[in-house]
């Protein structure tokens, strides 16, 4: 019996087509992805082959300015539209809080979504019951399929839960629910998730009874054979994992943002065993034409989108300076405008012995684009933030040493004075530059602010330490030279769209008036 | 566990010429300042000399300047101190310290330290 | 130079006292200031950096406070573990200074 799986992961928003690196779309002709595109092929192939499964691993929440003003709505009605079979959640997902998750999605869709190591407790155990489940059988053709749900286990601190959902490990959670499947005489089971490749290779071999593993969060391509685009396989589709029980189960994932659909051929005995996999993504370029109907809903739901990018969010009462002449050789207030909507969007209180989990913010200067004047009646609009950060990046939380961090502000200024981009904007950080010294050895003071206390004060960098730090996307992949960051980076868990973050701080404040302070000083 | 482990101590004619060094271990030895201080014999602690990660930035004491060089070896986890035109007022036990991430940073980890003595 | 005073140059203590320790800066070193217990015969062992903040394996007894000119140490209940030699560094410039040490004896 074969079985086809299409599937997609950390969509974060993408319902339009994008260009090639899942920016906003300029030359249509040579765009990708979009749910207009992603029908099209779903429904050839759904032609073609009489057992199909679409599944999405979670991360649909997120990413563009669809989310910031649907909140939800439009991934329950476009998946609704698409037929998916079903969802696992995914950390952002919880973005809006559970509230932000029940109402849009969890009530509107039409498929199950899935997670079996999240536990709801208290009042919210009797809200949320039924509305998202441990796993579903689904049947497809003559046979049933279990597909059985999992979410990243480090949401409390990547997203805002609340203190009512319990995330458990994955695969201690993960055991009883594929054990409960068996006795139903299911004997196909996909293991479906949000907690990154490394954790899909895990359940892969250490859960009983897991046939296929279907994963996000990392946003990982694989690709067996010459790829199609720019990105670079991390293994082979499917990757194959030895399970402790001696069993071959191929775990799969489709990178991100719509551009692909993973595509994954699976046989099975008539005793449920894989007796054979292949596939690999499909890049959803140019060459599959956009879906006339779900286009024409898409153009429909966009009018909204383009009215809310001229409203007001909140005013500044100074000149927000996002110039290069300042961003890229000094502290300028917009780098620390933007810093302090980075940390601000990340504050989780985690226990009474820290204020929150990560304090310090880097930013490279030369991802600021543009300054806002005050002086048009002070007025903050989306549409003048997305020209202070036109690339639609994340703002992402790694996990670093200290020398990695030393070696960051290092070159950070290695090359200072010829206005590039590399020069970092900050967020609880003190630095201090000297000039006069060899590049490489430049930094002379380095003090980043406390989590591990009360009362929040400036402590010298210790090189040894793992510290936790928000930052661009860009510089979590290398960005502006920063392959220390790349190279050296411990974890790394895609954040939230970086006007949004933005957005959402300056309605909160409604009144802004950031200030340059001595977060940076040059001796 | 951070080990410093100084060598090269010992009696000197006032004049001649002398070479500490300092094998580290237990911590990424190219990412760390390192420093001498010294401590003359039921004397205070004396700052000497330090160096940041690539020796690019060095710094002496006013009473030393001209007569000591530092240097380290990154492939080889060794600092060195090395002294000339030695005095009687040399005299002292020479520590190595691992400080930051620059020169200017705390002291952290001390060597037992090696004595060197200075006399005719 | 940046001179470092420590006072008092020695005190006597019981088992069980609170002890203060201050040292002052000739001029403002911000918080860049350490403090260091050296026993007889062994080497320095870090205390406390940047004015306040313990090193890893410190006991909380100690604590250190300050910023600009003025600092102390405190141990908040000496132990017989704790009679030493303690001195204060500055590590704001060049060339990096001690104070000249406060010695604490058994009363």
């Known amino acids: 019996w074969e079985l086809t799986i299409l599937h997609t992961n950390d969509v974060h928003s993408r319902l339009e087509q994008t260009s090639e690196d899942s920016s906003k779309c300029v030359n249509a002709s040579r765009c990708m992805g979009g749910v207009a595109r992603l029908f099209t092929k779903v429904q050839q192939i759904r032609r073609a082959e009489p057992n199909v499964l679409l599944l999405d691993a979670g991360d649909q929440y997120q990413g563009t300015i669809w989310f910031t003003v649907y909140k939800g709505a439009e991934v329950a009605h476009f998946m609704n539209a698409l037929r998916y079979d079903a969802m696992a959640l995914g950390n952002h997902e919880f973005d809006n809080g559970v509230e932000g998750l029940i109402e849009p999605l969890l009530k509107e869709a039409k498929f199950p979504i899935l997670s079996a190591n999240i536990k709801a407790k208290g009042p919210l155990a009797s809200q949320i019951s039924g509305l998202y489940l441990p796993y579903k059988v689904l049947p497809v053709g003559d046979e049933v399929v279990g597909i059985v749900g999992y979410t990243s286990k480090e949401t409390p601190f990547l997203s805002n839960p609340g203190t009512n959902l319990v995330f458990e490990d994955e695969i201690t959670a993960l055991q009883p629910e594929v054990d409960k499947l068996k006795t139903l005489n299911v004997n196909k089971i996909i293991a479906l998730g949000h907690s990154g490749f490394e954790t899909d290779k895990l359940i892969a071999q250490k859960v009983r009874g897991v046939d296929v593993v279907v994963g996000g969060h990392s946003n990982t391509f694989l690709y067996t054979g010459n790829p199609p685009s720019k990105e670079v396989p991390a293994g082979k589709y499917p990757f194959i994992v030895t399970s402790d029980d001696g069993r071959k189960v191929p775990v799969v994932q489709a990178y991100a943002f719509g551009k692909y659909l993973g595509y994954l051929k699976i046989e099975f005995d008539e005793r449920g065993n894989v007796i054979s996999s292949h596939g690999n993504p499909i890049l959803l370029n140019s060459s599959i034409p956009e879906d006339p109907s779900i286009k024409a809903d898409i153009n429909k739901w966009r009018i909204k989108l383009d009215n809310y990018s001229t409203q007001e969010l909140g005013k500044t009462i100074v000149y927000l300076d996002g110039s290069s002449q300042s961003c890229r050789f000094r502290e300028c207030n917009m780098g620390n405008l933007i810093c302090d909507a980075m940390i601000n969007n990340n504050l989780r209180h985690a226990d009474e012995m820290f204020w929150n989990h990560v304090s310090m913010c880097i930013l490279n200067g030369g991802g600021i684009r543009s300054p806002i004047d005050e002086r048009n009646n002070g007025t903050i609009t989306w549409e003048n933030l997305a020209a202070v950060l036109p690339f639609g990046g994340t703002f992402d939380l790694v996990q670093l040493k200290g020398s990695t961090l030393k070696k960051a502000f290092e070159h950070s200024v290695h090359r200072y004075g010829q206005s590039t981009g590399e020069f970092l904007q900050v967020g609880g950080i003190h630095v201090v530059y000297d000039l006069s010294r060899k590049p490489g050895d430049r930094v002379v003071k380095l003090d980043v602010l406390c989590t591990k206390c009360r009362v929040p004060s400036y402590d010298p960098l210790k090189m040894d330490e793992i510290y936790k730090v928000i930052l661009p996307n860009f510089l979590a992949n290398g960005g502006d030279g920063f392959q220390m960051i790349k190279d050296e980076l411990l974890r790394h868990d895609s954040g939230d769209q970086d006007i949004n973050v933005v957005s959402t701080y300056i309605s909160k404040m409604k009144v802004i008036y950031p200030a340059v302070e001595g977060r940076i000083k040059f001796s | 566990e951070v080990q410093l482990v100084e060598s090269g101590g010992g009696l000197v004619q006032p004049g001649r010429s002398l070479r500490l060094s300092c094998v580290a271990s237990g911590f990424t030895f190219d990412d760390y300042a390192m420093h001498w201080v010294r401590q003359a014999p039921g004397k205070g602690l004396e700052w000497v000399s330090g160096i940041s990660w690539n020796s690019g930035s060095i710094g002496y004491a006013d009473s030393v300047k001209g007569r000591f060089t530092i240097s380290r070896d990154n492939a080889k986890n060794s600092l060195y101190l090395q002294m000339n035109s030695l005095r009687a007022e040399d005299t002292a036990f020479y520590y190595c310290a691992q400080g930051g991430y620059a020169i200017l940073t705390a002291l952290e980890y001390w060597g037992q330290g090696t004595l060197v003595t200075v006399s005719s | 130079d940046i001179q470092m005073t420590q006072s008092p140059s020695s005190l006597s203590a019981s088992v069980g006292d609170r002890v203060t320790i201050t040292c002052r800066a000739s001029q403002g070193i911000s918080n860049y200031l350490a403090w260091f217990q050296q026993k007889p015969g062994k080497a320095p062992k870090s205390l406390i950096y940047?004015?306040?903040s313990l090193q890893s394996g410190v006991p909380s007894k100690f604590s250190g406070s300050g910023s600009g000119t003025d600092f102390t140490l405190t141990i908040s209940s000496l132990q017989p573990e704790d009679f030493a030699t303690y001195y204060c560094?500055?590590?704001?410039?060049?060339?990096?200074?001690f104070g000249g040490g406060t010695k604490v004896e058994i009363k």
């Open positions: 560094q500055q590590y704001n410039s060049y060339p990096l200074t």
């Open positions: 940047a004015a306040s």
